[in-house]
Interface confidence: low
């Protein structure tokens, strides 16, 4: 039975131009997590395995960093980066777990650096 | 659904070889990396070997480096590990694990199998 929930950093908004954090937490499950997937919409951009380290996709080495711990640092922001973030934990043996956040990009400096919405 | 079926474990003596077999019951190999990870009493789940589809790379954890081999046969859709000198220490269940193939790397494991039990022990 899966008992875990995941939290996240909710909705957040960043400038245009700047940086942000994706952060998800496992927590309230004994599960061992053997993998991290962070995908945008249907595009993998990141991998991290207990096993392997980290991979970035290609495609987004240049705008996409590992970490702090299982989280994701998005890096050279642009409007199109809004959208939907999802962190997939894979454990053993609950299964799958997945996370959302939305990220919406600014144009403007009106932009908060943070949680705008807590997802509980 | 691809499902993956191990066999080969058993109990063998310090000193003496196993070789176990992964069965996909769909197309798996060519694809995809094949790799083996196990899970001694009280521990941690631990990578083990890898092999890359086309079977030109080949990865191993340190401790098992010089004695187990990995190898797949793609017509078959299945894998082996063939550990040999086996210590007490290899005793653990070993699982058989499928990886999406990107260049450069294998990630993100998206079938495992149930296991086999190897007993290193005189």
């Known amino acids: 039975m899966m008992t875990g929930t995941i939290e996240t950093t909710g909705n957040i908004s960043a400038e245009k131009g700047g940086s942000i954090i994706l952060q998800c937490h496992l927590s309230s499950t004994t599960a061992q997590v053997t993998q991290v997937n962070w995908e945008q919409q249907d595009q993998l951009l990141a991998i991290c395995n207990a096993d392997l380290g980290w991979h970035i996709s290609p495609s987004f080495k240049d705008r996409v960093a590992p970490g702090p711990g299982l989280g994701l640092t998005l890096q050279s922001l642009t409007v199109n980066d809004t959208g939907e973030y999802f962190c997939i934990y894979h454990t053993y043996p609950d299964g799958t777990y997945t996370g959302r956040i939305f990220l919406e990009v600014l144009e403007s400096s009106v932009a908060e650096h943070g949680a705008r919405f807590q997802i509980p | 659904e691809v499902q993956l079926v191990e066999s080969g474990g058993g109990l063998v003596q310090p000193g003496g070889s196993l070789r176990l077999s992964c069965a996909a019951s769909g197309p798996t190999l060519g694809s995809y990396v094949m790799g083996w990870f196990r899970q001694a009493p009280g521990k941690e789940r631990e990578f083990v070997a890898a092999?890359?589809?086309?079977?030109?790379?080949?990865y191993y954890a340190d401790s098992v480096k010089g004695r187990f081999t990995i190898s797949a046969d793609n017509s078959k859709n299945t894998a082996y590990l063939q550990m040999n000198s086996l210590k007490p220490e290899d005793t653990a269940v070993y699982y058989c694990a499928r990886w999406r193939e990107f260049p450069g790397y294998y990630f993100a494991i998206d079938v495992w199998g149930q296991g086999t039990l190897v007993t290193v022990s005189s």
């Open positions: 092999i890359s589809g086309s079977g030109d790379d080949t």
